[in-house]
């Protein structure tokens, strides 16, 4: 196992209907033609595997299972995007990139985003 | 509607390893979101680790992450937790629990429907 670089941003804000997105980029050291992408989320004293995706480089991100995320693949960069988000999922989302094939394996991982999501005010009752 | 029963609890050295089973019932066991939970007396339920629906995405509570590992057979209707390095504060009951939800980036106690009767885990030192 060999180790790659991971680049995420340190910060975003969830918009106000629970959906946050950032890139995800990672220095890959050879051509690899199958990427395995996971988040995770590290908060509440849990590690949590919130989604996990493998591609072929050039090819659209399949996710696992009822996933809260999508994204795209452009080069050495994913773009992903975690949806239905709440208040109480603020925390560190930690990206980790994995190059299956061809050999060597290498696995990255990201120093984490902090992702703030803030519950929408319920609109007050209007008299008109 | 699942039914669970666990197995494979006992008492153990410190530094030994125990793999725990639950055995389910009911022909929808691979829609469940698997979790297995831990209680010592007089104590609050604790949440130990879950697995997705499909077995590709887990969580652990961070006193576990590295020692304990969760996984699943859909096609026998079981949920196992491997349980390495054990030390005497793992000593609990263990229950294992089904939720019907969509998998979370938090997966909590409130989610689950079902739950089995718990087997003792004893770590002595």
């Known amino acids: 196992c060999k180790a790659m670089h991971v680049a995420q941003p340190a910060v975003v804000l969830a918009s106000s209907r629970g959906i946050a997105s950032f890139v995800c980029e990672y220095a890959s050291p050879g051509k690899a033609t199958e990427v395995r992408v996971t988040v995770l989320r590290q908060a509440d004293s849990q590690v949590t595997e919130v989604c996990a995706a493998t591609y072929m480089m050039g090819n659209e991100l399949t996710f696992l299972d009822d996933s809260i995320c999508t994204g795209t693949s452009s080069g050495n960069q994913v773009n992903l995007t975690i949806q239905g988000l709440r208040a109480m999922d603020t925390g560190l989302y930690i990206c980790k990139v994995e190059l299956m094939y061809p050999p060597p394996y290498y696995l990255g991982i990201g120093n984490g985003t902090q992702i703030y999501v803030i519950d929408p005010e319920p609109c007050p009752d209007s008299d008109f | 509607e699942v039914q669970l029963v666990e197995s494979g609890g006992g008492l153990v050295q410190a530094g030994d390893s125990l793999r725990l089973s639950c055995a389910a019932s009911g022909r929808t066991f691979s829609s469940y979101i698997m979790g297995w939970f831990r209680r010592a007396p007089g104590k609050e339920r604790e949440f130990v680790a879950a697995i997705s629906s499909s077995g590709a995405l887990t969580s652990y509570a961070d006193s576990v992450v590295g020692r304990f590992t969760i996984s699943r057979d859909n096609a026998k209707k079981m949920v196992y937790l491997q349980m390495r390095s054990l030390k005497p504060e793992d000593t609990d009951v263990y229950y294992c629990?089904?939720?019907?939800?969509?998998?979370?980036?938090?997966?909590?106690?409130?989610?689950?429907?079902?739950w089995g009767q718990g087997t003792q885990v004893t770590v002595s030192s």
């Open positions: 629990a089904a939720a019907r939800v969509p998998w979370s980036p938090r997966p909590s106690l409130s989610t689950y429907d079902y």
